[in-house]
């Protein structure tokens, strides 16, 4: 009998409000044994895959997706999904990345480092689960 796959989580480091030109890393987490983590942007058509997975805890694995220099075009909604044979998980909630022109003052709405972005995380549409790993031949436009 196939196991029920827990939903992945998504967070962003150092937060979800990033100055133009700075870096951001999306962190996806799932159970041990995930073969592929996928970071999706806005819709399923734009994504990046990784199989560079490491332990987050004895019962969790994680993958990181780094954007070295954030541009305005990187702003938007992101979510994670993973492949643990023989199937894909549901998607995580959406995380909204905001890109600001320059470092703000004390009223800047930056989230705390490591935040999973509280109110900017949106429920995902879990209506599909039919992906195949990009590393097995399916390719889409890459995120960065």
């Amino acid at each position: 009998q196939e196991e029920d796959l827990p939903r992945p989580s998504i967070s962003a480091e150092p937060g979800t409000v990033i100055p133009l030109g700075s870096h951001v890393t999306f962190v996806c987490r799932g159970p041990v044994g995930v073969q592929t983590f996928r970071l999706e942007r806005d819709s399923r058509s734009t994504y990046n895959d990784t199989e560079d997975v490491s332990q987050a805890s004895p019962s969790e694995s994680e993958a990181r997706f780094r954007i070295d220099s954030v541009r305005e075009g990187n702003a938007g909604l992101y979510r994670c999904i993973y492949y643990k044979p023989p199937k894909w998980s549901e998607q995580s909630d959406y995380l909204e990345l905001l890109v600001k022109e320059s470092s703000g003052g004390p009223d800047s709405p930056d989230t705390e480092p490591g935040s999973s972005a509280g109110p900017t995380q949106r429920p995902s549409d879990n209506s599909h689960n039919e992906h195949a790993p990009a590393s097995q031949g399916l390719k889409a436009e890459h995120l960065y």
Epitope: T25, P31, V32, G33, V34, Q35, D49, T50, E51, D52, V53, S54, Q55, S57, P58, S59, S61, A63, R64, F65, R66, A134, S135
Partner: antibody, heavy 119, light 107 residues
Framework: EVQLVESGGGLVQPGGSLRLSCAAS????????MNWVRQAPGKGLEWVAR??????????FYADSVKDRFTISRDDSKNSLYLQMNSLKTEDTAVYYC??????????WGQGTTVTVSS | DIQMTQSPSSLSASVGDRVTITCLAS??????LGWYQQKPGKAPKLLIY???SLAEGVPSRFSGSGSGTDFTLTISSLQPEDFATYYC?????????FGGGTKVEIK
């Protein structure tokens, strides 16, 4: 079909250097961490080194037995993994395997290249 | 460093036998454990990952169990092609250590 083909092994004197290469094909090389594992004659398996992907700034990790002597590197544009081995010792004599990391586990192994350190 | 202690170091069995190999981690590793099979002159092959998940193409007579510090590889009905050396490995933290191996020989 996933293929990992090691080369560069051979006979070298103690204190000498060798550079091992691993040519990868049949998978998307730049999304995988990669490893070197060795096996001395008649002995068990010993992990040697690991290199992460660009998402982790190509972070490297080494076994204590090779730290400061061996350097792992990769060239994603050439789908290649390398192991630069300096100050070689007789105890470095082994078959060296290139290993593709998947899900954190060692899913695919090359056939190995033999390194013999002897005077 | 996490030490992996495998037992037995060798065993003799017959075709059709049920074979069990154990691996003990010196500290908890959750399910970050793999099992590998190696035949003489060949590269190792992944059998089990994440302690219990069967790798692609591996026969269902192989199974893995355990979590934390105690792990088991079971071959439900030994076949002629299963005579080999088996290794466990922890992938929880570097250095990524292997057990000493278990050689399964023909009785």
């Amino acid at each position: 079909e996933v293929q990992l083909v090691e080369s560069g092994g051979g006979l070298v004197q103690p204190g000498g250097s060798l550079r091992l290469s691993c040519a990868a094909s049949g998978f998307t090389f730049n999304i995988n961490a990669m490893n070197w594992v060795r096996q001395a004659p008649g002995k068990g398996l010993e992990w040697v080194a690991r290199i992460r992907t660009k998402n982790y700034n190509y972070a490297t990790f080494y076994a204590d037995s090779v730290k400061d002597r061996f350097t792992i590197s990769r060239d994603d544009s050439k789908n290649s993994l390398y192991l630069q081995m300096n100050s070689l010792k007789t105890e470095d004599t082994a078959v060296y395997y290139c290993v593709r990391d998947r899900a954190g586990f060692f899913a695919y192994w090359g056939q190995g290249t033999t390194v013999t350190v002897s005077s | 460093d996490i030490q992996m202690t495998q037992s037995p170091s060798s065993l003799s069995a017959s075709v059709g036998d049920r074979v069990t190999i154990t691996c003990l981690a010196s500290q908890t590793i959750g399910t970050w454990l793999g099992w590998y099979q190696q035949k003489p002159g060949k590269a190792p092959k992944l059998l089990i990952y994440a302690a219990t998940s069967l790798a692609e193409g591996v026969p269902s007579r192989f199974s893995g169990s355990g979590s934390g510090t105690d792990f088991t590889l079971t071959i439900s009905s030994l076949q002629p092609e299963d005579f080999a050396t088996y290794y466990c490995q922890q992938l929880y933290s570097t250095p990524l250590t292997f057990g000493g191996g278990t050689k399964v020989e023909i009785k």
